[in-house]
């Protein structure tokens, strides 16, 4: 049964390339474990960048190398992605599940654009 | 197409052991909670035991606790069911289901009798 | 005796509307949970009807309906066919036994 999930349109990475955004979905049940992926499509290609499953109430826990963080309240997630440069520039879309208890139930968002400006360098100071 | 595949039952005396098997096929097996669901001849559905996608919550029926065991192999889409000192009130078929019993297998007969 | 409560059995003439009761409680439709509801027909496996309390799979006609209300349920069967004479269960998650929770069972009888 799909769900609805909604997320920001478009958010500008900072100058450290760490880009923040909140992904809320409507929940039909009462879910006690959820599972968050982001995945990113940029030229009709859609790759995951980072999945964590948690337990309503506690942290989002991703893997160790994983350039995401997050934390959840309620039926909202709020995302970070770390690490980015300009190539990653694109279109960043929020899936959630609801695992536990059954029904299953999946919802994918309208992505977010995020924008990625690779900081100028430092001119020297000679 | 979901597919559910039950095997494993049979006649057994009081007492005896049973294990049965569901094997899965057209959907992601792993992402799914999985019951096990019996009807006694001439009576209504009973939820036995369920799983859920990650083995990490696992529930029984008041009857049955204690006496069956849930398991499933996501590698091999497959649920289980181990049935130990069976009772003649465990007659029944026996329902493979997944998610909230949205797609059922054809059951397996399970017949408890010396 | 189930968790679920339905009546044990109902009928109606061709082209009717017959409703089925499922009254449960704080633990599981009153908690929330969504109502699902399926069809046994003689001799066979039960097949989904209704599910998320008024969603209907693909290949189910619309003139079966679901609806919820506080700690109740109800399914909803119009213009009656003799094909409908079938078993009816409703079941939903129940948070104190940790699991899934069957109705009784309806029995539904097309008279005439």
């Known amino acids: 049964k799909a769900m609805h999930v909604a997320q920001p349109a478009v958010v500008l990475a900072n100058s450290r390339g760490t880009a923040s955004f909140v992904c809320e979905y409507a929940s039909p049940g009462k879910a006690t474990e959820v599972r968050v992926t982001v995945l990113r499509q940029a030229d009709s290609q859609v790759t995951e960048v980072c999945a964590a499953t948690y337990m309503m109430g506690n942290e989002l826990t991703f893997l160790d190398d994983s350039i995401c963080t997050g934390t959840s309240s309620g039926n909202q997630v709020n995302l970070t992605i770390q690490g980015l440069r300009a190539m990653d520039t694109g279109l960043y879309i929020c899936k959630v599940e609801l695992m536990y208890p059954p029904p299953y139930y999946m919802g994918i968002g309208n992505g977010t654009q995020i924008y990625v400006i690779d900081p100028e360098p430092c001119p020297d100071s000679d | 197409e979901v597919q559910l595949l039950e095997s494993g039952g049979g006649l057994v005396q009081p007492g005896g052991s049973l294990r049965l098997s569901c094997a899965a096929s057209g959907f992601t097996f792993s992402d799914y909670y999985m019951s096990w669901v019996r009807q006694a001849p001439g009576k209504g559905l009973e939820w036995v035991s369920g799983?859920?996608?990650?083995?990490?919550?696992?529930g029984y029926a008041d009857s049955v606790k204690g006496r069956f065991t849930i398991s499933r192999d996501n590698s091999k889409n497959t649920l289980y069911l181990q049935m130990n000192s069976l009772r003649a009130e465990d007659t029944a078929v026996y329902y493979c289901?997944?998610?909230?019993?949205?797609?059922w297998g054809q059951g397996t007969l399970v017949t408890v009798s010396s | 005796q189930s968790v679920l409560t339905q009546p044990p059995s109902a009928s109606g003439t061709p082209g009717q509307r017959v409703t089925i009761s499922c009254t449960g409680s704080s633990s599981n439709i009153g908690a929330g949970y969504d109502v699902h509801w399926y069809q046994q027909l003689p001799g066979t496996a039960p097949k989904l009807l209704i599910y998320?309390?008024?969603n209907r799979p693909s290949g189910v006609p619309d003139r079966f309906s679901g609806s919820k209300s506080g700690t109740s349920a109800s399914l909803a069967i119009s213009g009656l066919r003799s094909e409908d004479e079938a078993d009816y269960y409703c079941a939903v998650w129940d948070d104190s036994l940790n699991g899934v929770v069957f109705g009784g069972g309806t029995k539904l009888t097309v008279l005439g």
């Open positions: 799983i859920s996608w990650s083995s990490r919550d696992k």
């Open positions: 289901t997944t998610d909230l019993a949205r797609y």
């Open positions: 998320g309390n008024d």
